[in-house]
Interface confidence: low
C-alpha cells in the first residue's frame, strides 16, 4: 500500500491530525522535499547576520554577514570580523598575503602584483602586501631626449594567488 504522505509536495506536510491530508507549511516554516510529516522552522538571520535570501514554503532562508564581517563555514553559520588589508581569509583564518601578492581591501583574495615588464614598463614604486606596484615609464622613455612620460598602464585583471 502506498503511503498517502508520499503525495504531499514540497511546501506542504502530511497532517496526521487531519487524516494525513497535505497541509501547507505554516508561516515561517518550510519543507524542501515531498512526503514530509513536519515543516522545518525557517532560519532567522539576526544580530550580526542579515538575510541574503528570504525563506519560502519550499526553501530555507539564507544568511550572510553585516558589513565588517564575513561568513565562516559552508552554510554561513558563523560571522567573523573581516581580515586586515594585506591579508586574505582561508580555512586556516586570516593569513598574510604571500610575497608578490597584495590585498588592498579587508575581504577578498590576495592578488599578484602587476608585472610592469609585460607592458615594457619599469617598477616606479615597489609593491607591498597591501598595495600593488606602481609602474613607471619604460626604460626607453627614461633615456635622454625622451619627450614625454607615458602614464602608468592600468593593472591587469588579477588572478588567484597560490595558497
Amino acid at each position: 500500500l502506498q503511503d498517502p504522505c508520499s503525495n504531499c509536495p514540497a511546501g506542504t506536510f502530511c497532517d496526521n491530525n487531519r487524516n494525513q491530508i497535505c497541509s501547507p507549511c505554516p508561516p515561517n516554516s518550510f519543507s524542501s522535499a515531498g512526503g514530509q510529516r513536519t515543516c522545518d522552522i525557517c532560519r532567522q538571520c539576526k544580530g550580526v547576520f542579515r538575510t541574503r535570501k528570504e525563506c519560502s514554503s519550499t526553501s530555507n532562508a539564507e544568511c550572510d554577514c553585516t558589513p565588517g564581517f564575513h561568513c565562516l563555514g559552508a552554510g554561513c553559520s558563523m560571522c567573523e570580523q573581516d581580515c586586515k588589508q594585506g591579508q586574505e581569509l582561508t580555512k586556516k583564518g586570516c593569513k598574510d598575503c604571500c610575497f608578490g601578492t597584495f590585498n588592498d581591501q579587508k575581504r577578498g583574495i590576495c592578488r599578484p602584483w602587476t608585472n610592469c615588464s609585460l607592458d615594457g614598463k619599469s617598477v616606479l614604486v615597489n609593491g607591498t602586501k597591501e598595495r600593488d606596484v606602481v609602474c613607471g615609464p619604460s626604460p626607453a622613455d627614461l633615456s635622454p631626449g625622451a619627450s614625454s612620460v607615458t602614464p602608468p598602464a592600468p593593472a591587469r585583471e588579477p588572478g588567484h594567488s597560490p595558497q
Epitope: L72, G73, G75, S77, K91, G93
Partner: antibody, heavy 117, light 108 residues
Framework: EVQLQQSGAEVKKPGATVKLSCKAS????????IHWVNQRPGQGLEWIGR????????AYAPKFQDRATLTVDTSTNTAYLELSSLRSEDTAVYYC??????????WGQGTTVTVSS | QIVLTQSPATLSASPGERVTLSCTAS???????LHWYQQKPGSSPKLWIY???NLASGVPARFSGSGPGTSYTLTISSMEPEDAATYYC?????????FGQGTKLEIK
C-alpha cells in the same frame, strides 16, 4: 543549498574494513576542512580526524591513527573515511562535517556502521 | 588531551524557566575555540554557540554563552519546549579536538 550527503548504512564483520563517503554540494570542498566524528549508541561525540582537501594535510586522533584513513576526491567533491580491523565497539553513527580553523559548522546526516559477527 | 566535563548529565526544566548548563575544561581553553552543539534524537548535531558567546545563525536570542579559561556556561533565559535536546561543549584549541559527554535537557 549547502549539503553533505553521506553513504548508506553498513553491516560488517569484525576484522573487516569499511569505506564511508561524504559528498559535498553547494560549495567547493577545497574551501573547508572535512572532519569525521563518530557517536556510539547512546554516547557522546568523538573526533576521528580531519583532512584539508586543498593540500591533503591530515590529522588523526591518537586512538584512530593506526586504523583510519582519510582521503578526498576533489574532482567529485567527495571525502572518504576508511576504517580497518573493525571491532564491535566501532558500531556507531559516523558523521562528516565541514570546518575551518576553529569550529565544525555543518554536518552530514550520518552513516550507521554496525559491526557484528 | 583536554577533557571537557559537562554538568549536570541530565536536567529537567519547565517552560519559562532559566536554565544553565556547565562545561569545565581540564586545562585552559581560549574563548575563541570553545563551542556548543545542539543534538536532537535521530538528528545530526548543529553548531549552536561558537567562540563562547556567539549565537550560530538561526539560534534564538534566549540562548547565551559565557566563560573564560576553564569554566564555560550555556544559558537559556526562558526554556521553550523546542529547546529539549542534548547539548555538547567542544574545544578546538588543542589537538585532538574534544567534546564534553553532553547534557540532556528535558522539558517538564
Amino acid at each position: 543549498e549547502v549539503q553533505l550527503q553521506q553513504s548508506g548504512a553498513e553491516v560488517k564483520k569484525p576484522g573487516a574494513t569499511v569505506k564511508l563517503s561524504c559528498k559535498a554540494s553547494g560549495f567547493n570542498i577545497k574551501d573547508y576542512y572535512i572532519h569525521w566524528v563518530n557517536q556510539r549508541p547512546g554516547q557522546g561525540l568523538e573526533w576521528i580526524g580531519r583532512i584539508d582537501p586543498e593540500d591533503g594535510d591530515i590529522a588523526y586522533a591518537p586512538k584512530f591513527q593506526d586504523r583510519a584513513t582519510l582521503t578526498v576526491d576533489t574532482s567529485t567533491n567527495t571525502a572518504y573515511l576508511e576504517l580497518s580491523s573493525l571491532r564491535s565497539e566501532d558500531t556507531a553513527v559516523y558523521y562528516c562535517t565541514t570546518g575551518n580553523y576553529y569550529a565544525m559548522d555543518f554536518w552530514g546526516q550520518g552513516t550507521t556502521v554496525t559491526v557484528s559477527s | 588531551q583536554i577533557v571537557l566535563t559537562q554538568s549536570p548529565a541530565t536536567l529537567s526544566a519547565s517552560p519559562g524557566e532559566r536554565v544553565t548548563l556547565s562545561c569545565t575544561a581540564s586545562s585552559s581553553v581560549s574563548s575563541s575555540y570553545l563551542h556548543w552543539y545542539q543534538q536532537k534524537p535521530g538528528s545530526s548535531p548543529k553548531l549552536w554557540i561558537y567562540s563562547t558567546s556567539n549565537l550560530a545563525s538561526g539560534v534564538p536570542a534566549r540562548f547565551s554563552g559565557s566563560g573564560p579559561g576553564t569554566s564555560y556556561t550555556l544559558t537559556i533565559s526562558s526554556m521553550e519546549p523546542e529547546d529539549a535536546a542534548t547539548y555538547y561543549c567542544h574545544q578546538y584549541h588543542r589537538s585532538p579536538p574534544t567534546f564534553g559527554q553532553g547534557t540532556k535537557l528535558e522539558i517538564k
